[in-house]
Amino acid sequence: VPPGEDSKDVAAPHRQPLTSSERIDKQIRYILDGISALRKETCNKSNMCESSKEALAENNLNLPKMAEKDGCFQSGFNEETCLVKIITGLLEFEVYLEYLQNRFESSEEQARAVQMSTKVLIQFLQKKAKNLDAITTPDPTTNASLLTKLQAQNQWLQDMTTHLILRSFKEFLQSSLRALRQM
């Protein structure tokens, strides 16, 4: 079953197709389910989920975060600004999702599914934002060197990085989901 589709929708092509907002909502919830499965493996494998040393590793990362100025929160909500932030943030997360590949043993396919589903989500959102100003795409060279740097970390830092990426991505998607429901 492809991400964001009901098995019954696939089995019965005559059914009403999903609208743009339904596809986006469903896609985000599908990715969140995938993140939950990955977090389960991460937390079972190491004690990172209870660690108090997160700040140490967080200094090395520049994970996308929602801020007041992005217009995605209840106070100061701005539909256009927020939509741009969601798309930009997801594009910035792509390098971190690439890093997650090969970081899982039993959930390797789940990690790939999260990555591919995020690409699809970005496409859905870009269609929704087609009338908005151009959205800046991360520089591939910068991403490549960041990926190399992350992969060169010691085991403990790699485990911590994995945990932080999953946690931040989950928080980002949850904020996005709430915001998109006012759009």
Epitope: T19, Q74, F77, Q182
Partner: antibody, heavy 120, light 111 residues
Framework: EVQLVESGGGLVQPGGSLRLSCAAS????????MSWVRQAPGKGLEWVSR????????YYADSVKGRFTISRDNAKNTLYLQMNSLKPEDTAVYYC?????????????WGQGTQVTVSS | QSVLTQPPSVSGSPGKTVTISCAGT?????????VSWYQQLPGMAPKLLIY???KRASGIADRFSGSKFANTASLTISGLQSEDEADYYC??????????FGGGTKLTVLG
């Protein structure tokens, strides 16, 4: 305190037009998707239309599509419903409603309503 | 007007429990957890009680609870009080970026 005050209702002949307004106060109007819901005399509630927080997206019930237009002016904290080609079955109390934050299609605040009567 | 199916009326004695059902289809009630419930006192605007199937709105007593199974949602009111006498409406997101309401249920508190 959240307040939604509707106005613009009245008696109109079939085929006529009306423009309803809803003045919002007590919350950041531009942060919320808004809707119109109506209630025919002695009948249940019927969802009419929805507009996104910034006014980019609009949605309509099939019964009003092509005849009604929802809009908003965030600078004036006001929601509108332009109703054209009115029919007797559009007779109802029209409520201005706010969508709960971050929730899929739940209405957390309602105005007191404005009566629209379509009759010859 | 496409509506969800609710019983026209229910009744119960003070202190008792009543349940109001709301039957829909896989395109509305059965699609996601997007059911809400509203109370409308005579001559008043509706008031949100429950959203997302089972979450209570701010300031709503825990006597009110919601649930869902397949294409049918339910509102349960326990410890019935005379002030609960009102019309109750369910609502749901409906596939195609629409919302749909139930026909309403009149709750009578006996005695």
């Amino acid at each position: 305190e959240v307040q939604l005050v509707e106005s613009g209702g009245g008696l109109v002949q079939p085929g006529g037009s009306l423009r309803l307004s809803c003045a919002a106060s007590g919350f950041t109007f531009s942060s919320y998707a808004m809707s119109w819901v109506r209630q025919a005399p002695g009948k249940g509630l019927e969802w009419v239309s929805r507009i996104s927080s910034g006014g980019i997206s609009t949605y309509y019930a099939d019964s009003v599509k092509g005849r009604f237009t929802i809009s908003r002016d965030n600078a004036k904290n006001t929601l509108y419903l332009q109703m054209n080609s009115l029919k007797p079955e559009d007779t109802a109390v029209y409520y201005c409603v706010r969508y709960a934050w971050g929730v899929q299609w739940a209405f957390d605040f309602w105005g007191q309503g404005t009566q629209v009567t379509v009759s010859s | 007007q496409s509506v969800l199916t609710q019983p026209p009326s229910v009744s119960g004695s003070p202190g008792k429990t009543v349940t109001i059902s709301c039957a829909g289809t896989s395109s509305d009630v059965g699609y996601g957890n997007y059911v809400s419930w509203y109370q409308q006192l005579p001559g008043m605007a509706p008031k949100l009680l429950i959203y997302d199937v089972n979450k209570r709105a701010s300031g709503i007593a825990d006597r009110f609870s919601g649930s869902k199974f397949a294409n049918t949602a339910s509102l349960t009111i326990s410890g019935l009080q005379s002030e609960d006498e009102a019309d109750y409406y369910c609502a749901s997101y409906k596939r195609g970026d629409n919302a749909v309401f139930g026909g309403g249920t009149k709750l009578t508190v006996l005695g």
